[in-house]
């Protein structure tokens, strides 16, 4: 079992992995789907100007198993963090989610 | 109040290598060694993201786009972070800042060096 400290920085650390993991869950729950998050392919990330701190969109390429067979995604998730904590994230949004082929 | 002072940056070409130290001040071995000590990274235009940390247990853990490529270690005793970067690639450009996260409980207290450049360039 971790410490708390070892948790928070696993957090910090796989921040793009649980984005792209989030992005799955929700597509799963919204379209009653059984993806399973396999890896992220790419991942960029835009930031709002002069508040670039505050909210970022991603654009991840995932790959993800349907029905045991390996797909590319493209996911877009918004981003809102805490201006006087810019680490943690606030609120968070899956935008869009399509498929892109096969892996 | 934790102070933390970098040394070891500059230029590098792609494949070389580079070794970050901090020192930190301010703050009792037995106070520093309840927190965690490790790196983040700005590159221009981005936000600061970790890249690699040794927890109060001396665990090390990384960024997965820095597995394999970086070491970071820990000097519980002279209150030390360094972080050797080997096979250096240009989008390891940024500035690397040495970090301390305190856990205070009801939320995280971070500290911060002042930075110190990363550019790899052929």
């Known amino acids: 079992m971790g410490s708390r400290l070892e948790e928070e920085l696993r957090r910090r650390l796989t921040e793009i992995e649980e984005l792209a993991r989030f992005a799955v869950d929700e597509h799963n729950k919204k379209e009653n789907a059984l993806l399973e998050f396999v890896r992220v392919v790419k991942a960029k990330e835009q930031s709002s100007v002069p508040h670039w701190w505050w909210t970022t969109m991603y654009y991840l390429t995932l790959e993800a198993k349907d029905g045991g067979k390996k797909k590319l995604y493209e996911a877009k998730v918004w981003v809102k963090r805490d201006p006087n904590m810019i680490f943690k994230i606030n609120f968070k949004e899956l935008q869009e989610f399509k498929p892109v082929g096969d892996a | 109040e934790v102070q933390l002072q970098e040394s070891g940056g500059g230029l590098v070409q792609p494949g070389g290598s580079l070794r970050l130290s901090c020192t930190a001040s301010g703050v009792t071995i037995s106070a520093l060694n309840a927190m965690a000590m490790g790196w983040y990274r700005q590159a221009p235009g981005e936000r600061r993201v970790m890249v690699a940390a040794?927890?109060?247990?001396?665990?090390?853990m990384y960024r997965e786009s820095v597995q394999g490529r970086f070491t970071v270690t820990r000097d519980f005793t002279n209150k030390m972070v360094s972080l050797q970067m080997d096979n250096l690639k240009p989008e390891d450009t940024a500035v690397y800042y040495c970090?301390?996260?305190?856990?205070?409980?009801?939320?995280?207290?971070?500290?911060w060096g002042q930075g110190t450049q990363v550019t790899v360039v052929q």
């Open positions: 040794v927890s109060e247990r001396g665990n090390a």
């Open positions: 970090h301390v996260l305190e856990d205070r409980v009801d939320s995280f207290h971070d500290y």
